[in-house]
Amino acid sequence: TPGPVRRSTSPPVALRELIEELSNITQDQKTSLCNSSMVWSVDLTAGGFCAALESLTNISSCNAIHRTQRILNGLCNQKASDVASSPPDTKIEVAQFISKLLNYSKQLFRYGH
């Protein structure tokens, strides 16, 4: 299924919920997240939530990150093709990406950018 056309949602509420969800995922990791799938280590500072969504959309059928995908889908108000950032050349495990996204989200929430 191609990338969805997105309607943006209320950022402050969704951002708070994203942080809660990412925190839950990092705390609840009893087994390997998404069967240790690898994702592109995108530059979140440049591409933001749209870049994060684009990277995580390539993870298939992982219920553990389903809600994260939904929240990112709401936070990103661009089509996937509109995301302008340099193409990544490194892949990391989903768990590592989730931690990276959590830190980025906390910074955004803290400094209100």
Partner: antibody, heavy 118, light 111 residues
């Protein structure tokens, strides 16, 4: 390209257990969700159960006590069992897959007609 | 469970005319600004085929005479100019909440 194929008995007797298999090719079941849906002759689709790539299972609330879904990743097969079959369970049973967000069912098998009769 | 109610049960439309199918959910299927509502087409003797996902996004290869709209609990599938090959039963389906549920279907015929 992902393809799904259902297999199982065409005829089962009342009170027996139905076992259906969905064989998936073109995708690994560790990263692919499989759903079971049924359709009685001339009637609407009814969603039965699903198993996510990472193992989470969801069942139809009304049929939950009769259904079991499982998968064999090495064979790339998903198995649905339905206990205590009744003539009203006569239907075409489909397996359908959804790999990526937003998880709409974009790949369907051709279906397997199961008749429940003594 | 979310109950999906489709109307009408059947629809008879002349070739080239507009066909409109409605689907109402018993509770909102919206999540974070998106509607987790999908539409399927089932032609006689065939399995269903995904037409529209997330309420309004056309699946690859689907003709643009098909369109979807709506949010919350009320959704519409429109065929702008009915063609002979559009004769089928159309189903709405939600996956905002588990378990997934389908509508009862709308049969589209040619008048």
């Amino acid at each position: 390209q992902v393809t799904l194929r259902e297999s199982g008995p065409a005829l089962v007797k009342p009170t027996q257990t139905l076992t259906l298999t969905c064989t998936v090719s073109g995708a690994s079941l560790s990263a692919y969700s499989v759903n079971w849906i049924r359709q009685p002759p001339g009637k609407a689709l009814e969603w039965l159960a699903m198993i996510w790539g990472d193992g989470k299972i969801v069942y139809n609330s009304a049929l939950k006590s009769r259904l079991t879904i499982s998968k064999d990743t090495s064979k790339n097969q998903v198995v649905l069992t339905m206990t205590n079959m009744d003539p009203v369970d006569t239907a075409t049973y489909y397996c359908a897959g959804d790999g990526y967000f937003p998880y709409a069912m974009d790949n369907w098998g051709q279906g397997s007609l199961v008749t429940v009769s003594s | 469970d979310i109950v999906m109610t489709q109307s009408p049960d059947s629809l008879s439309v002349s070739l080239g005319e507009r066909a409109t199918i409605n689907c109402r959910a018993s509770k909102s299927v919206d999540s974070y600004g998106n509607s987790y509502m999908h539409w399927y087409q089932q032609k006689p003797g065939q399995p269903p085929k995904l037409l529209i996902y997330l309420a309004s996004n056309l699946e690859s290869g689907v003709p643009d005479r098909f369109s979807g709209s709506g949010s919350g609990t009320d959704f519409t599938l429109t065929i702008s100019s009915l063609q002979a090959e559009d004769v089928a039963v159309y189903y709405c389906q939600q996956n905002n909440e588990d378990p997934r549920t389908f509508g009862g279907g709308t049969k589209v015929e040619i008048k």
